[in-house]
């Protein structure tokens, strides 16, 4: 498909032209800013943003890749380096450590610097490394996270939690002997190591004790509280608060965010990670959208501002299913959740950081022609004479072999949302991939990100940009509209 | 392998201070740009700038990710959309017609709008789009084109032809109707098209009259001319130029770089393209970095400054063979030009970008242990039981059945430079990839170069920042130590 | 911490050969060019020559060094300068330089080198 | 390729504004291949401006370098007791081969 337009020189000529324009007016702003956001787009890697670029401009009836994402509008672009000290391909716990801590870390690990070792708990004390989101909350701010995963998950936790294992959610993952060492299962973590004026995500049964049927599946006893315990860690957590509010279904959330009396909000919409998009029953569980305007309505009442972690955790986990269709429609949410925070917000006053943690070993090739389907089959065949699709995997549970070959595709059939891509190797899970990531950023100090940089840089911007620890001294006028 | 010092966060906290340091200090220069050049990285898409970065920094006996490419040294960065008007994944001759002429083609044409259709020879005039070496040479600039594939090639074609098919090469490539109707083949236009004072690579059997024995394979008659019309297109362009020389070989293009009486050079050091650097023997063959050199020290005599194309063209070739070791060496010697020209020129004068054509649908997972071989394997078993790359590729030549299962790999055949990864579906030739790549800049209106943009802007800073067409009312200062 | 330091400076007897070594420490030299530079008691730099760390090893001498003067690159991180046929107006402080994009950043603190019989 | 420098001595007060100028025998190499150094007695040259007019790293904004093609300056302004030094140009031309030169260099003698 040739647009008519797009045979005219004229057609990027002038638009080249006005991208040069809009380059030209590009003013670096010399202001602090009052509000943080980072908005993680988990195993989001430059070939998944392009895919979803592609998908959303489909999905609006246009051809696909000449369409903008909210992130492609972000003026400003860096390449992050996301190795571990000791993997050249991370896990989202160490990567977290990175983007919110500003150190690097080990493998599994969380909040701590790589002086601890996975799964070690007597490594832990005395090498935790503090998040820019706690640093935010010293200084005044209202802080926030916000997950489609579970909220103990890797990468929420790292702006609050300090663990050699990524996998302790609840006190029923943590051996014995870590317990009796004195390491925190990260549910605990989540509620007392700092106060966090919202929570939204799933992990409901990570915060009651086992027994305690869930609300929503109160017959399935595989979703109840998982706790050894004996806590109710909610309850805890609404102690602590005189307006503080706990909600596990969307009318409630909406509610709350709209109470002017509720001044800390959590809430958990499943027991485990929140379903995908394509799953969700809209009537029960909000939205990546919906909870991202809900956590801005209630952070930005706080004069001194708010720092807000947003993250679109389950494109990761499509990937490692090996279903494209599955991590694009996430981040497509993800990339609504940017578009409607932008609405929300100033970027005057408020420095938003789109990334990833990592990558994914996901390819889009294969020669397609404009406009025909980001799941589709490329033109021709392969050597062995079936078809194949442009989404690919290096490796993951889509590799298959049927009577001794590579199992035939239809376009009916790669378009399915259960459809698994094909892989070159046969893992249960498909893996991360190393290559950089994008971030893309938009506010105050926006221009700071720039250049190839380690993913540590990240939080060290953020702190810079808002004057936190330990750049109190940043010497930044203050942000536009402060009431300090 | 976990080095000691970055253990310690302080090792993280200050480097990331340092890099927010470097990115204040950076101020947009407000000068034009005397000489421009372009570095292509053929399919260096972003997991092949790092996984080139850990090789390269391996040679150096480093752990490997922590290190610097010359590329990752340049402080601006955008993301570059490279799709062509009618295919979501492109060709390296669409998106030549897009980074040098500033208008988006149609697969497997060269300089020429979306009007023109591919292998149409009627559909070619009227349909031409001029290059910004052209517009360089017409506003009194030197000019040059380096390639390490033959000069005919896709991408530096884009500099100076204007073709519905990329493959006519030589008049013997050219259909006999297409030849009535006008339409010329590449090499002829190479010599008629515009004055071009360096050009230097392969593709020597395209100038010269069929039967012409080739001066390095005397004895193989398919190395040598293959043109159809008789014409000598070397001696044709030495006689345009009283201080002109044609070179083949490394010695004889050394010395004619630093003659100063020479004031036009060809050098085609290869019948076709140039041998991979691997292969290559240098006694006969320059490599990259040296003719890269060569040609800037020809160009910087121009007071009016100059326009360099240089292509690392066959980092491309290396991928389609799905031999990620030639891929990659490839890339660390394009690097290792692209050093070498920021030792011979100044950002003060020279905007410098960094760019790729397109990607491949080459993935680089599995988790490996830092300081590990980027070729080597994953740690643990596939679910098959074999040991798995951690490179790996969504199709290619790599694809094998044994037996009517994958085959098991070592590390030592793993690390062959003619080792082919596996891949998930078997194809002669690995396909491009269709994600966004990476665009580095430096120098002056480097700063312009920022977010996300369409593969033409590129061609358009080069242009507005040279104040050439047509940007000639750009309204910039002079650059600094202008002897116009 | 980037260092040079140069080595094998002497006092030598006229028409001797002599051999300097420049050595690299912190980096390595692939991506370099290594200069040598004199400067003869209370007297101004006088530029002997470089080598081409980077390729194979190619070299540019000044006019005057030209024949009694070599330099070649001898591992990753060292380079040579090979004197011959010295006479008292050798006499001098030699220095090698890092030549990178950035000039001459990088440069070794001197050895003497003292030719008298 | 001949380098030609503002002969020594040259004397500024504190505070004041030193010029010192270098001029080629023919033009350098992209018409500003050209780098000024200061060296003190017993150390070794320390880059100042490369590129006619870049700023070396960790060298103070006091020092400034122009010029192209043949002629260059070196200007030091709010001149300090510690820029008490001597100063070198650099220049270097492509012609059969690399040639660099160094000028003769200038005393600079701060009262």
């Known amino acids: 498909i040739i647009p008519v337009e797009e045979e005219n020189p004229d057609f990027w000529n002038r638009q080249a032209a006005e991208a040069l324009g809009a380059a030209k007016k590009l003013q670096p702003a010399q202001t602090a800013a009052k509000n943080l956001i980072i908005f993680l787009g988990d195993g989001m890697g430059v070939s998944t943003v392009t895919a979803a670029r592609i998908l959303k401009g489909q999905k609006k009836d246009k051809l696909g890749p000449e369409t903008f994402l909210a992130m492609d509008r972000f003026p400003y672009v860096a390449l992050s380096k996301t190795y571990s000290v000791d993997k050249h391909v991370p896990d989202s716990g160490a990567t977290a450590t990175a983007y919110l801590c500003g150190v690097k870390g080990n493998f599994q690990t969380i909040g701590l610097s790589a002086a601890a070792r996975f799964n070690q708990c007597n490594t832990t004390r005395g090498n935790e490394v503090i998040s820019v989101m706690n640093r935010a909350k010293k200084a005044g701010k209202s802080v926030g996270v916000v997950t489609t995963t579970r909220v103990q998950h890797a990468s929420p936790a790292g702006a609050y939690a300090h663990t050699v294992n990524r996998n302790w959610y609840s006190d029923a993952d943590v051996p014995a002997s870590a317990r009796q060492e004195g390491c925190q299962d990260i549910a605990t973590q989540l509620i007392s190591n700092m106060d966090i004026d919202v929570i939204l995500g799933g992990g409901r049964k990570y915060m009651f004790p086992m027994g305690t049927p869930d609300p929503e599946y109160p017959d399935d006893y595989s979703q109840g509280g998982t706790r050894l315990d004996g806590k109710n860690l909610v309850q805890e957590w609404l102690a602590k608060h005189q307006g503080a509010r706990y909600v596990w279904n969307r009318t409630e959330l909406l509610q709350a965010s709209l109470d002017p009396s509720v001044t800390h909000l959590m809430g958990l919409f499943e027991p485990g990670d929140m379903k995908y998009e394509i799953h969700r029953d809209s009537t029960l569980d909000p939205s990546l959208m919906e909870m991202t305007e809900a956590a801005l309505l209630l952070l930005s009442r706080n004069p001194r501002g708010f720092f807000l972690f947003v993250e679109g955790g389950r494109i990761d986990h499509g990937h490692h299913e090996s279903r494209a269709y599955r991590a694009l429609t996430e981040t497509i949410m993800f990339d609504d959740a940017i578009e409607r925070a932008g609405q929300l917000t100033s970027e005057e006053d408020t420095l938003s950081l789109v990334t990833a943690d990592h990558s994914h070993v996901f390819s889009f090739g294969g020669y397609p022609l404009r406009g025909s389907s980001i799941f589709g089959l490329a033109p021709g065949k392969a050597r062995d004479r079936k078809a194949y699709t442009v989404l690919l995997y290096g490796n993951g549970p889509g590799y298959v072999l049927k009577d001794g070959a590579r199992p035939d595709v239809t376009e009916s059939e790669s378009g399915s949302p259960e459809y698994r891509q094909q892989s070159a190797v046969p893992l249960d899970g498909e893996t991360h991939a190393g290559e950089d990531v994008a971030v893309f950023a938009r506010g105050p100090q926006a221009h700071l990100v720039h250049g190839v940089q380690e993913q540590t840089f990240i939080a060290h911007v953020m702190a810079f940009a808002a004057c936190l620890e330990p750049y109190t001294a940043c010497d930044l006028a203050p942000r536009a509209g402060t009431t300090d | 392998i976990i080095p000691v010092e970055e253990e310690n966060p302080d090792f993280w906290n200050r480097q990331a201070a340092e890099a927010l340091g470097a990115a204040k200090k950076l101020q947009p220069a407000q000068t034009a740009a005397k000489n421009l050049i372009i570095f292509l990285g053929d399919g260096m898409g972003v997991s092949t700038v790092t996984a080139a970065r850990i090789l390269k920094g391996q040679k150096k006996d480093k752990l490997g990710p922590e290190t610097f490419l010359a590329m990752d040294r340049f402080p601006y960065v955008a993301l570059s959309k490279t799709y062509s008007v009618d295919k979501h994944v492109p060709d390296s001759g669409a998106t030549a017609t897009a980074y040098l002429c500033g208008v988006k083609g149609n697969f497997q044409t060269i300089g020429l709008s979306a009007a023109a259709r591919f292998n149409q020879c009627n559909t070619t005039r009227g349909n031409e789009v001029i290059s910004v070496m052209n517009r360089a040479k017409k506003a009194g600039k030197s000019v040059g084109v380096v390639t390490t594939t033959r000069v005919q090639h896709a991408s530096p074609a884009g500099a100076y032809a204007h073709t519905v098919n990329r493959n006519w090469y030589s008049d013997a490539d050219v259909p006999a109707s297409a030849r009535q109707e006008g339409c010329q083949d590449i090499a002829t236009q190479l010599i008629s098209n515009m004055d071009i004072d360096v050009i230097l690579g392969g593709g020597r059997k395209y100038m010269f009259p069929m039967g012409t024995p080739d001066p390095e394979y005397p004895d193989d008659y398919s190395q040598g001319g293959t043109r159809l019309d008789g014409k000598n297109l070397v001696q044709e362009w030495l006689a345009k130029h009283q201080g002109a020389r044609y070179v083949w070989n490394r010695t004889e293009l050394l010395q004619a770089s630093l003659d100063p009486s020479v004031t036009h050079l060809m050098g085609l050091f290869e019948p076709g393209d140039m041998k991979y650097e691997i292969h290559r023997d240098s006694t006969l063959d320059p490599s990259l970095m040296e003719m890269t050199e060569a040609a800037l020290l020809l160009l910087s005599r121009n007071p009016r400054g100059f326009f360099l194309f240089v292509e690392g063209g066959r980092i491309d070739h290396g991928h389609h063979e799905s031999r990620a070791y030639r891929a990659l060496t490839e890339t660390i010697m394009f690097d290792d030009a692209i050093e070498r020209a920021g030792q011979l020129t100044s950002e003060e004068d020279t905007l410098s970008l960094v760019t790729a054509d397109h990607s491949h649908v080459f993935s680089f997972g599995g988790y490996p242990l830092r300081g590990s071989s980027i070729f080597g394997l994953a740690p643990g078993k596939a679910r098959d039981r074999k040991a798995y790359t951690v490179l790996l590729y969504g199709n290619g030549p790599g694809y094998v059945l044994k037996d009517g299962a994958r085959p098991d790999v070592t590390e030592s055949e793993s690390g062959s430079p003619e080792y082919r990864q596996q891949s998930a579906v078997p194809l002669d030739g690995e396909t491009h990839a269709g994600e966004d790549v990476a665009v580095f800049a430096r120098g002056p209106q480097a700063h312009l170069v920022h977010g996300v943009q369409e593969q033409t802007f590129i061609a358009h800073v080069m242009a507005f920042a040279a104040c050439l067409e047509p940007y000639t009312a750009c309204d910039l200062a002079p650059r600094a130590g202008t002897t116009d | 911490q980037e260092q040079l330091k140069e080595s094998g400076g002497d006092l030598v007897k006229p028409g001797a050969s002599l051999t300097l070594t420049c050595t690299a420490s912190g980096f390595t030299l692939s991506t370099y060019w290594v200069c040598w530079v004199r400067q003869a008691p209370g007297k101004g730099l006088e530029w002997i020559g470089c080598i081409d760390t980077v390729s194979s090893g190619d070299t540019y001498f000044a006019s005057w060094a030209k024949g009694r003067f070599t330099g070649s690159k001898t591992s990753s991180t060292t380079v040579t300068l090979q004197m011959t046929s010295l006479t008292a107006a050798d006499t001098a402080t030699y220095f090698c330089?890092?030549?990178?994009?950035?000039?001459?950043?990088?440069w070794g603190p001197g050895t003497l080198v003292t030719v008298s019989s | 390729l001949v380098m030609t420098q503002t002969p020594s001595p040259v004397s500024a007060a504190v505070g004041g504004t030193v010029t010192i100028s270098c001029q080629s025998s023919?033009?350098?190499?992209?018409?500003?291949?050209l780098a000024w150094f200061q060296q003190n007695p017993g150390q070794p040259p320390k880059l100042l401006i490369y590129?006619?007019?870049k700023l070396a790293s960790g060298v103070p904004s006091r020092f400034k370098g122009s010029g192209s093609g043949t002629q260059f300056t070196l200007t030091i302004s709010d001149v300090q007791c510690d820029d008490a030094a001597t100063y070198y140009c650099l220049g270097a031309y492509v012609s059969n081969g690399w040639y660099f030169a160094f000028g003769g260099g200038t005393e600079v003698v701060v009262k």
């Open positions: 023919q033009s350098v190499y992209n018409n500003n291949y």
């Open positions: 590129w006619a007019s």
């Open positions: 330089a890092r030549r990178t994009g950035s000039g001459w950043t990088l």
